[in-house]
Amino acid sequence: EVEKTACPSGKKAREIDESLIFYKKWELEACVDAALLATQMDRVNAIPFTYEQLDVLKHKLDELYPQGYPESVIQHLGYLFLKMSPEDIRKWNVTSLETLKALLEVNKGHEMSPQVATLIDRFVKGRGQLDKDTLDTLTAFYPGYLCSLSPEELSSVPPSSIWAVRPQDLDTCDPRQLDVLYPKARLAFQNMNGSEYFVKIQSFLGGAPTEDLKALSQQNVSMDLATFMKLRTDAVLPLTVAEVQKLLGPHVEGLKAEERHRPVRDWILRQRQDDLDTLGLGLQGGIPNGYLVLDLSMQEALS
């Protein structure tokens, strides 16, 4: 805390300018009016204040706005945002996308800080849903943003926002997240033709059910192995050898290299060895000829 002392004669700040960098901390406290600072916040960013001096300026704003800063001040915080704690940010009501962008710019190129995470959370909650413009902005600054959300939070993403998602935005998503995003993507892209649809839906397929994979296998999509390996195991298991062959097209040869890894390994165990042999890849581990396969889960469902 800076002690309260009278401002020396002639040092009262008339405006926020570079002369203030030569003020000692106590002089800043005594000579800079908080209301003046609030109205000229946009100037602070261009002035090379030390972090200790920024502490004083923050203290002045905190005294002026104990319930949280107004958006007119927040939008121009610039580097002073780095001084804010998550507790400070929780008091804010940020509604403008321009304000969000201005503050994200301060953190650009670095991992998401607790301050930024809190800011985004406040902003999204204030909006009620993750609309396309917000998602566009957030994924531009943080490609992994979507995958940092819980399935519950993702459920508030409207299908229209899915158009903003790029493949790299989904790199770190787990199956539970893709389970939520896939139906939204399917809805968003439903009016596209076959090949265009596949290009768009491909990165979301980790959430696709068996019936959708079967449908895709009828469309000559030539899914690559990397995409196939990210599919849900429970969705892949019921696919026949013929369906997988159609789904992968020329990439089917890649199954050999992946035969020890899920979901390929588990899928092989479910296929007749005779059928696997038709691929000519030397895949081993299928059900030997003459064995009867009982689907007990089906039997339980019927009883």
């Epitope: 090379p48 204040f49 030390t50 200790e52 580097y79 780095l82 301060v106 650009k108 670095h110």
Partner: nanobody
Framework: QLQLVESGGGLVQPGGSLRLSCAAS????????MGWYRQGPGNERELVAV???????SYADSVKGRFAISMDNDKHTVYLQMDSLKPEDTAVYYC?????????????WGQGTQVTVSS
């Protein structure tokens, strides 16, 4: 992190000149300003001159017209050309850099270099 190393201090007669240098290394990509502070015997540390990454310089009244600060962005080095030195300029001179982004925002300081102005 960011490291700052000063050089160029020494003993000089009144009216003489010295040129201080400060080289930054490490996380130099986010430096928004560099400056020189000094601390004389029994005094608080005070700002002498500062220059932003865009080349804007500011000087304390006591050194205006005598000192000149400059920055070589490519070498991440800041210089302080000190002319017409006076005994009251005697101090330890510290280099300072502002780093304004995560993950390590803050003020970074060098170890200091002694400047003594005496006949």
């Amino acid at each position: 992190q960011l490291q700052l190393v000063e050089s160029g201090g020494g003993l000089v007669q009144p009216g003489g000149s010295l040129r201080l240098s400060c080289a930054a290394s490490g996380s130099v990509n986010s430096i928004t300003a560099m400056g020189w502070y000094r601390q004389g015997p029994g005094n608080e540390r005070e700002l002498v001159a500062v220059i932003t990454d865009r080349g804007r310089a500011s000087y304390a009244d006591s050194v205006k017209g005598r000192f000149a600060i400059s920055m070589d962005n490519d070498k991440h080095t800041v210089y302080l050309q000190m002319d017409s030195l006076k005994p009251e300029d005697t101090a330890v001179y510290y280099c300072n850099a502002h780093r304004r982004t995560w993950p390590h925002p803050g003020d970074y300081w060098g170890q200091g270099t002694q400047v003594t102005v005496s006949s």
